[in-house]
């Protein structure tokens, strides 16, 4: 229904705490360089205004759209042009163009320092002094670095953060209580960020239909006992929620997500037998829980898929009658039978089925043409299964760090023009798939591996879009989202690449490396590895292993030496010489 004042409506629905959190996230995602204090001031002004509208919906400006209200706030910031350059031009536009302009200026890779966690004592002190400000800082810092982070989910992670601090700051050994728990939240939040970015990419590049297809497949896997009408309703609602969040309409998004969670909990009987535990939780936990609820048990008596989609005489008539509905039912029926497939694979199969019907239904004898379609799915299914087996075997053999290095070599050979920091970030993220997925039961590996890889590769594409340097990457990123991962997997050594000349300084290290945390040490070594491959793209695995082992030995020796500086300055040049010889 229409409300006289949209801002009053959302404030009432969400409550002050969530309202303020969401407005802070929205501002931080739009203007990523502003300080927390600048944004906190704007949030307070917006909240005070919302309260006046709650008191009197007819008050001045209360009838304005949220985009107008928020956009006016952002555009009133002093020194906008000095700090944000051409983003200030957005303020010359009218809504809805102004909001579109803000969205286009979101930066997926802002030049902000990494979000450093303070040490435990300091963290607990500032948390105890002012928990609200502390959590505000968390929302601001995450949101500005991840401008498409799913806002209601970020509120959930902030709540987790809050609970961990409340518990651990009361402990004697705060550090050992906080570190593993906060690391866990950070890891989950980073995965959530790349997954949501993928959803927004799908929406932005291919529209709502593409996202809805993703949602139908995913929901059908999770709720195989729900009928097609129920799945369609959930997919439509989920598409609306994601469209709003991706579009910067965070208050509407969070409100609609809460509504969807409420609907699911009120209709468990027609959706799934696994929802009760989630539905007993408070709002943020409930919605999070529902988003990753375990798959319901598949109905035992499902007929073979061929009956309705190959053997039925009416296939082409049903397809002609309502293409999207017929393809939707195919995707639903196939997905509910295959919780062991990735959503990407299911969408590729649906696309293959659609292409087959397009071709065959135009022929004089369609059944003879589409009769073999299910057999033609086989290679499409085998390819990701082989990928999972090969990569999980390699991960089990090498461990996470070694597996990341193997991926780094592979991807540097595929796209040596890409900047080394981007290659290292991508390889480290891709390499985490082993730890994340390869330890799962067999039937959960494929969906875990492929859907995670697809999300990471989406980030590679977004970063590459900013500064396109590799034709290989451009080719894979230009196609449909579901074809990206197979495209990247199929890439081989880029034969057009002219190797980088060997620069000794790239491989010169100093004693400061010894005091770096293990993660930073790994990044330094991986940076050197990528540079080696750029110098010798056709180096064998054996040659690279020899050099990297030598390098590790050199670091180990010099970091244990009494006079580290002397060791680095004398042994370093010898290492460089040996590297050159080994790769000659």
């Amino acid at each position: 229904e229409a409300h006289k004042s949209e801002i009053a409506h959302r404030y009432n629905d969400l409550g002050e705490q969530h309202f303020k959190g969401l407005v802070l996230i929205a501002f931080s995602q739009y203007l990523q360089k502003c300080s927390y204090d600048e944004h906190a001031k704007l949030v307070q002004e917006v909240t005070d205004f919302a309260k006046t509208c709650v008191a009197d919906e007819s008050a001045a400006n209360c009838d304005k759209s949220l985009h107008t209200l928020f956009g006016d706030k952002l555009c009133a910031i002093p020194n906008l042009r000095e700090n944000y350059g051409e983003l200030a031009d957005c303020c010359t536009k009218q809504e809805p163009e102004r909001n579109e302009c803000f969205l286009q200026h979101k930066d997926d890779n802002p030049s902000l320092p990494p979000f450093e966690r303070p040490e435990a004592e300091a963290m607990c002190t500032s948390f105890k002094e002012n928990p609200t400000t502390f959590m505000g800082h968390y929302l601001h810092e995450v949101a500005r670095r991840h401008p498409y982070f799913y806002a209601p989910e970020l509120l959930y992670y902030a709540e987790q953060y809050n609970e961990i601090l409340t518990q651990c700051c009361a402990e004697a050994d705060k550090e050992s209580c906080l570190t593993p728990k906060l690391d866990g939240v950070k890891e989950k939040a980073l995965v959530s960020s790349v997954r949501q970015r993928m959803k927004c990419s799908s929406m932005q590049k291919f529209g709502e239909r593409a996202f809805k297809a993703w949602a139908v497949a995913r929901l059908s896997q999770t709720f195989p006992n729900a009928d097609f009408a129920e799945i369609t309703k959930l997919a439509t609602d989920l598409t609306k929620v994601n469209k709003e969040c991706c579009h910067g309409d965070l208050l509407e998004c969070a409100d609609d997500r809460a509504e969807l969670a409420k609907y699911m909990c009120e209709n468990q009987a027609t959706i799934s037998s696994k929802l009760q535990t989630c539905c007993d939780k408070p709002l943020l936990k409930k919605a999070h829980c529902l988003s990753e609820v375990e798959h319901d048990t598949m109905p035992a008596d499902l007929p073979a898929i061929a009956a309705d989609f190959v053997e039925d005489q009416e296939v082409c008539k049903n397809y002609a009658e309502a293409k999207d509905v017929f393809l939707g039912t195919f995707l639903y029926e196939y997905s509910r039978r295959h919780p062991d497939y990735s959503v990407s694979l299911l969408l590729r199969l649906a696309k293959k089925y659609e292409a087959t019907l397009e071709k065959c239904c135009a022929e004089a004898n369609p059944p003879a043409c589409y009769g073999t379609v299910l057999a033609e799915f086989q290679p499409l299914v085998e390819e990701p299964k082989n990928l999972v087996k090969t990569n999980c075997d390699l991960y089990e053999k090498l461990g996470e760090y070694g597996f990341q290095n193997a991926i780094l070599v592979r991807y540097t050979q595929k796209a040596p023009q890409v900047s080394t920091p981007t290659l290292v970030e991508a390889a480290r993220n891709l390499g985490r798939v082993g730890t994340k997925c390869c330890t799962l039961p067999e039937d959960q590996r494929l969906p875990c591996v492929e859907d995670y890889l697809s999300a990471i590769l989406n980030r590679v594409c977004l970063l590459h879009e900013k500064t396109p340097v590799s034709e290989h990457v451009t080719k894979c990123c230009s196609g449909s989202l579901v074809e990206r991962r197979p495209c990247f997997s199929a890439l081989t050594v880029d034969e057009t690449y002219v190797p980088k000349e060997f620069k000794a300084e790239t491989f010169t290290f100093h004693s400061d490396i010894c005091t770096l945390p293990e993660k930073e040490k790994q990044i330094k070594k991986q940076t050197a590895l990528a540079e080696l491959v750029k110098h010798k793209p056709k180096a064998t695995a054996e040659q690279l292993k020899t050099v990297m082992d030598d390098f590790a030995q050199f670091l180990d020796t010099c970091c244990k030496a009494a006079d580290k500086d002397t060791c680095f300055s004398t042994e370093g040049p010898n290492l460089v010489t040996r590297c050159k010889d080994a790769l000659a």
Partner: nanobody, 115 residues
């Protein structure tokens, strides 16, 4: 909504000709192969002829090959069946269908061949 409306049936003497039409709506006609099927009194449905979406490929049942010609006009969303040298055994209700369907979902048009 897909709609198929057949017309052109009637009573003819053996050896004569008839031309059946099928007006299609509610779908992209040119993207779909079309067929004619028939049902003789007290019998099941029998496939007669099919044509590809572009009209270049045609198929016929042995019982009508050489006598019947299937064609289409995509600009008019219409399917045709030219029936020459009609025989008593061609008496049936004729239906047009989408793709290779052997299921009638329209009214059909009755062809009676009798002297």
């Amino acid at each position: 909504k897909v709609q198929l409306v057949e017309s052109g049936g009637g009573l003819v003497q053996p050896g004569n000709s008839l031309r059946l039409s099928c007006a299609a709506s509610g779908f992209t006609f040119s993207s779909f192969g079309m067929s004619w099927v028939r049902q003789a009194p007290g019998k099941g449905l029998e496939w007669v002829s099919s044509i590809s979406g572009g009209g270049s490929d045609t198929l016929y049942a042995d019982s009508v090959r050489g006598r019947f010609t299937i064609s289409r006009d995509n600009s008019k969303n219409t399917l045709y069946l030219q029936m020459n040298s009609l025989r008593a055994e061609d008496t049936a209700v004729y239906y047009c269908t989408i793709g290779g369907s052997l299921r009638a979902s329209s009214q059909g048009t009755l062809v009676t061949v009798s002297s």
